[in-house]
């Protein structure tokens, strides 16, 4: 049985040309997690594997760096950036977990951090 | 260099037993998942088994549940295929492929030819 | 189960030629779409990883494109050595699937 929940960074924004971390937070559960993809919509960006490190989808090297932990660090933010992200966290024995964060880069520099909040 | 050699193959009557081999050299073989994908003669790729990495966690192709089981020796740098009441449709060159991230198949085995017939 | 859809299943074409193949998922897959090569008595040999990126040592006329359910693998100019089978894979989620292939022959 599923019992972890994911809390992510939630509904955020930055200013274009700037960056921003994604993060999410398994909690609850006790499952050994083996891996975390990031996905941008139909994207892969990155991988973390418990074995074999990060792997950075080579069309995004430039512009994403492993971590902080498990996260993701978005850089030099366009406004294309704009969009859902997931964070898919594989484990063991429980499954899948599947965090979403909506980003939207703004053209201002007025760009505020949404709340935290879970999902179950 | 990586490497991939299976072994084991041959000529087995319906109903009877086989273990594929696959030794891998080159990397380390513990970190990453591993597959097995068949061939029959003249038609396309089919996946059989896959094993991860950490949790040795296996999954398989519903033709072959139930009587395949896939595992794996991080010590001996093997792989494995335990065949049983294999059927003539399972006649087949049959590969082992390394899988990191359990995404892509990046190296693969020469392959080792079953032939189950009476 | 997830079905890949490729086609065409054979072309025939020319030294030089722009090359496409596609191939459909069932369902959506995001990126989880990969593409070998395999020539006769050979083992598959891994072209694109996760829709669009080269795998290394892969020529860089290979290219990949797609996301969801519909992805394409160009030659942009075929060489003599591409004459193959090529097949797409996904691995979304188990039972891992490949499509049917497309074999480009010699026009």
């Known amino acids: 049985m599923m019992t972890g929940t994911i809390e992510t960074t939630g509904n955020i924004s930055a200013e274009k040309g700037g960056s921003i971390i994604l993060q999410c937070h398994l909690s609850s559960t006790t499952a050994q997690v083996t891996q975390v993809n990031w996905e941008q919509q139909d994207q892969l960006l990155a991988i973390c594997n418990a074995d074999l490190g990060w792997h950075i989808s080579p069309s995004f090297k430039d512009r994403v760096a492993p971590g902080p932990g498990l996260g993701l660090t978005l850089q030099s933010l366009t406004v294309n950036d704009t969009g859902e992200y997931f964070c898919i966290y594989h484990t063991y024995p429980d499954g899948t977990y599947t965090g979403r964060i909506f980003l939207e880069v703004l053209e201002s520099s007025v760009a505020e951090h949404g709340a935290r909040f879970q999902i179950p | 260099e990586v490497q991939l050699l299976e072994s084991g193959g041959g000529l087995v009557q319906p109903g009877g037993s086989l273990r594929l081999s696959c030794a891998a050299s080159?990397?380390?073989?513990?970190?990453?998942?591993m597959s097995w994908v068949r061939q029959a003669p003249g038609k396309g790729l089919e996946w059989v088994a896959s094993?991860?990495?950490?949790?040795?966690?296996?999954y398989y192709a519903d033709s072959v549940k139930g009587r395949f089981t896939i595992s794996r020796d991080n010590s001996k740098n093997t792989l494995y295929l335990q065949m049983n009441s294999l059927r003539a449709e399972d006649t087949a060159v049959y590969y082992c492929?390394?899988?990191?991230?359990?995404?892509?198949?990046?190296?693969w085995g020469q392959g080792t030819l079953v032939t189950v017939s009476s | 189960d997830i079905q890949m859809t490729q086609s065409p299943s054979s072309l025939s074409a020319s030294v030089g030629d722009r090359v496409t193949i596609t191939c459909r998922a069932s369902?959506?897959?995001?990126?989880?779409l990969n593409w070998y090569q395999q020539k006769p008595g050979k083992a598959p040999k891994l072209l694109i990883y996760?829709?669009?990126s080269l795998q290394s040592g892969v020529p860089s006329r290979f290219s990949g494109s797609g996301s969801g359910t519909d992805f394409t693998l160009t030659i942009s100019s075929l060489q003599p050595e591409d004459f193959a089978t090529y097949y797409c894979?996904?691995?979304?989620?188990?039972?891992?699937?490949f499509g049917g292939g497309t074999k480009v022959e010699i026009k």
């Open positions: 094993i991860k990495s950490s949790t040795s966690s296996t």
């Open positions: 369902q959506s897959i995001s990126s989880y």
């Open positions: 996760a829709a669009s």
């Open positions: 080159g990397f380390t073989f513990s970190s990453y998942a």
């Open positions: 492929a390394r899988e990191p991230y359990s995404v892509w198949m990046d190296y």
């Open positions: 894979q996904q691995s979304y989620s188990t039972p891992l699937t």
